[in-house]
Amino acid sequence: MAVTACQGLGFVVSLIGIAGIIAATCMDQWSTQDLYNNPVTAVFNYQGLWRSCVRESSGFTECRGYFTLLGLPAMLQAVRALMIVGIVLGAIGLLVSIFALKCIRIGSMEDSAKANMTLTSGIMFIVSGLCAIAGVSVFANMLVTNFWMSTANMYTGMGGMVQTVQTRYTFGAALFVGWVAGGLTLIGGVMMCIACRGLAPEETNYKAVSYHASGHSVAYKPGGFKASTGFGSNTKNKKIYDGGARTEDEVQSYPSKHDYV
């Protein structure tokens, strides 16, 4: 039961995380105009990965897409790439993890296959989360650098009375959404990897030996039984000589050669 819960929770957490990564990538408020210590402007600027927007105090908002690819800063392109890779990996991870879920039965898929799929999706979620965190962090670093550069040049060209106030940008909501979403995806991935350990079937390195007793023909398999997938013919998976009926999770909690650290 604990394995199913861990796997299910990992899936849900990753799902929320990836939804957050998608939301952050699409959001326009990656950087917002810094209003602190600035003259109060009747215009508010904010920028995303795909377009920049201006909201006037009158209530009108105008957004313009970045219709150039080569003219954009390399760092912005890198952030875009990281976020897209994160989304793609996360989406594939979600797809894989759906089929790996213990509560979903597909054909005669064995637990070993489900364990492998759970591990695969977990790794994908971890990489996806890291991509998102890296992307957001790179953008944040870019903002901090530009912020202090523009602060140093805050009042440029003060030829006489005329002052040109440079617009400074600070962290937008999308950065926080991205960090949280990346973290959730990462946590979800770790949970999937942990769940994989419990899903792995128990095996031993030696073959089953048949003992032929007079009068009875009973085959004992010292390694216990393979964890049931819950499908078709292999429904009678309890050891008849076992003192009490044990749940699958309890049986699988013993160490096996499929344990992942």
Epitope: A42, E56, S57, S58, F60, Q163, T164
Partner: antibody
Framework: EVQLVESGGGLVKPGGSLRLSCAAS????????MSWVRQAPGKGLEGVAT????????YYPDSVKGRFTISRDNAKNSLYLQMNSLRAEDTAVYYC???????????WGQGTLVTVSS | DIVMTQSPDSLAVSLGERATINCKSS????????????LTWYQQKPGQPPKLLIY???TRESGVPDRFSGSGSGTDFTLTISSLQAEDFAVYYC?????????FGGGTKVEIK
Amino acid sequence: EVQLVESGGGLVKPGGSLRLSCAASGFSFSNSAMSWVRQAPGKGLEGVATISSGDSYTYYPDSVKGRFTISRDNAKNSLYLQMNSLRAEDTAVYYCARQGYGNALDYWGQGTLVTVSS
Amino acid sequence: DIVMTQSPDSLAVSLGERATINCKSSQSLLNSGNQKNYLTWYQQKPGQPPKLLIYWSSTRESGVPDRFSGSGSGTDFTLTISSLQAEDFAVYYCQNDYYYPLTFGGGTKVEIK
């Protein structure tokens, strides 16, 4: 058709108070930033107060800060200007105006005259 | 507060002639986000409220004749009336629409020569 109608002007003694109202119609009032602009007799225009569409922000020039308060009632499509501690130099025609593209004042009322005199 | 300085104070022009009004702001009105200048021009006739002519320094309000044009960027702006008509004799104001409080220029009176 956009309409802005000011009311509440009149004669008031120095140090007195007055509340101007502006009834708006023909546009989405709650989504529009609004301003009060005044014009002293024979003089130029002076922005007196601005209120943002969400009612979150209000702005005043130093000449009226602390004395004038702009407010709005979106349910009644009305804009208000509460004027306290009035001075002789506050004598002017007060216009109510809507902010449009570029924060420009695209629609104006006909104005209401406020006279501060003893 | 941003200071808006208009010149000249008054201008005597003959019908059909070109009129040019200048406006200078104490700070740049150019917004880097959309590369637009937040300067507005108004026309006011006696006994009437001002009428919006041009916003974003060069965008004509709908219904405004094309003889009115705005230009300039940053701190220096110009309103040009290419061929003055009788109905154009009025007072013209420029306005800072970028910094609060939104401030007006002193006005330029265009009179018949």
